[in-house]
């Protein structure tokens, strides 16, 4: 028995070949002997049943001369899954058609971090097929009647070429995924005390009509609980602020990409935030983490102090040095002090390996007096 695979809604070609490679009489029937179509010696396609009943069935007249008499079934339905019989040259050939339906849950437009389940459904009780989907960038996901793709990323967007294999017979279909998300999952902003801070939240996709609402929650390092800094609405590319905290006095750009400005980096703002964006007609939310590290350099009571506040990595080093002098290195990464600093220009650096994350300079004029 020959097996043919077909996807619901598409077309399938069931083969029937003459051993003599020339035109001959043939008939295609259902397994219950009902006639579908055939050729009875005059080179004319004869259909069985009413035209409306068999308007989806056809053959390739151009192939008959070569001894090929395929049965073409268009707009495949699940109930087309059955055995078809081709009668020619006093023999019968059975062809098994397996029609499958592909469903995507929850759909092909998803949010970053969500999962997609691809399910193959069929009326026939076939053994497990192999389903394999390949992204144009090379990523491959495989399964059987159920294929799962978890923790989707923006990079998983675009066209996937999928193949269903059963008894060495293949059928392919395509799917276009659209994974909505932020360009970056996380970002860190390094600022000296008093500098203006800009947070940017660019989306990694372009949608003409985008509606939703968002909020930035902030957990300051020095605070016991997090606080909502701003809430906003999004309609197309238009951003409108609903509510903003009085301290800090944040400003938000009125159009995409999402952008926030903090007038000054102050020690009490150092910490991390989570911007969430809920999109209309989508379950779940998009998230982007943002971190603020603030550096403060001050001279007080004959001691020069450099301090960083906010989420720093253990690999980071804080150094305080005067030009042409040996550096004072912080052991605890976050504070370094020099007692009775010499007059002159001092520099504080926050670095990770050989990369300087930020630096701040202070002019020590005399003991107890300074100028940044």
């Amino acid at each position: 028995k020959t097996l043919v695979l077909g996807k619901e809604g598409e077309s399938a070609e069931l083969p029937c070949e003459s051993s003599q490679k020339k035109i001959t009489v043939f008939t295609w029937k259902f397994s219950d002997q009902r006639k579908i179509l055939g050729q009875h010696g005059k080179g004319v396609l004869i259909r069985g049943g009413s035209p409306s009943q068999f308007d989806r069935f056809d053959s390739k007249k151009g192939a008959w001369e070569k001894g090929s008499f395929p049965l073409i079934i268009n707009k495949l339905k699940m109930e087309d899954s059955q055995t078809y019989i081709c009668e020619l040259e006093n023999r019968k050939e059975e062809v098994e058609l397996w029609v499958f339906k592909v469903t995507f849950s929850p759909g092909t437009s998803l949010l970053q971090g969500q999962s997609l389940t691809l399910t193959l459904d069929s009326n026939s009780k076939v053994s497990n097929p192999l389903t394999e989907c390949k992204h144009k960038k090379g990523k491959v996901v495989s399964g059987s009647k159920v294929l799962s793709m978890s923790n989707l990323r923006v990079q998983d967007s675009d066209f996937w070429n999928c193949t269903v294999t059963l008894d060495q017979k293949k059928n392919w279909f395509g799917m276009t995924l659209s994974v909505l998300g932020f360009q970056k999952a996380s970002s860190i902003v390094y600022k000296k005390e008093g500098e203006q801070v800009e947070f940017s939240f660019p989306l990694a996709f372009t949608v003409e009509k985008l509606t939703g609402s968002g909020e930035l929650w902030w957990q300051a390092e020095r605070a016991s609980s997090s606080k909502s800094w701003i809430t906003f609405d999004l309609k197309n590319k238009e951003v409108s602020v609903k509510r903003v905290t009085q301290d800090p006095k944040l400003q938000m750009g009125k159009k995409l990409p999402l952008h926030l400005t903090l007038p000054q980096a102050l020690p009490q703002y150092a910490g991390s935030g989570n911007l969430t964006l809920a999109l209309e007609a989508k379950t779940g939310k998009l998230h982007q983490e943002v971190n603020l590290v603030v550096m403060k350099v001050a001279q007080l009571n004959n001691t020069l102090t450099c301090e960083v506040m906010g989420p720093t990595s253990p690999k980071m080093r804080l150094t305080l040095k005067q030009e042409n002098q040996e550096a004072r290195v912080s052991e605890e990464q976050k504070v370094v002090q020099v007692v009775a600093p010499e007059t002159g220009l001092w520099q504080c650096l926050l670095s990770e390996g050989d990369k300087v994350k930020m630096d701040s300079r202070i002019q020590v004029l005399s003991r107890g007096v300074n100028q940044t």
Epitope: N236, S240, K255
Partner: antibody, heavy 118, light 107 residues
Framework: EVQLLESGGGLVQPGGSLRLSCSAS????????MSWVRQAPGKGLDWVSS????????YHADSVKGRFTISRDNSKNTLYLQMSSLRDEDTAVYYC???????????WGKGTTVTVSS | AIQMTQSPSSLSASVGDRVTITCRAS??????LGWYQQKPGKAPKFLIS???SLQSGVPSRFSGSGYGTDFTLTISSLQPEDFATYYC?????????FGQGTKVEIK
Amino acid sequence: EVQLLESGGGLVQPGGSLRLSCSASGFTFSDYVMSWVRQAPGKGLDWVSSISGLTGNTYHADSVKGRFTISRDNSKNTLYLQMSSLRDEDTAVYYCAKDNEDYYMDVWGKGTTVTVSS
Amino acid sequence: AIQMTQSPSSLSASVGDRVTITCRASQGIRNDLGWYQQKPGKAPKFLISAASSLQSGVPSRFSGSGYGTDFTLTISSLQPEDFATYYCLQDYTYPRTFGQGTKVEIK
């Protein structure tokens, strides 16, 4: 062709009220942000107010907050500016402007003159 | 509100001159800045959006640049029809704010 035509300007006494209108044509009015910008005699441009077509949100300059109200009637393709408690410093040419898809004021009317004087 | 400081407030130049007008924002505004040209008794004309994007129909002698707080409008070779007042507008957030204007006069 996109066109904006302001009307309703005139002479009004301090403390008085006036309603400006801006009739729009040549584009889908309800899709766009519309604004009022004014220019006092011999002075620069001064943004007064904006209203979103999508959300209906309104925005006003601090100098007119509580005195001026921007509104729109999408069925009539008309933008309004209701001005009350008028002051001498409100004397200006008032322009109606349409935002483009990138939210910049790209098309302006010819303006209507408002004179506040006793 | 974001303040926009435009300089110079006026300048005298000749036809063919290269003219540069600057605009500084009191805080970062990305590239959300527009430039407008206004002639006496006329409505402003939109020249440049997003700091550097020339509007259709605007001659290529006009160009804009900048990001954050500092922006520039340049007219590479001044033509007689370019004598006018030029305004920058911050379109980052409400309230929208204009620069005070730069009047370009004939020398």
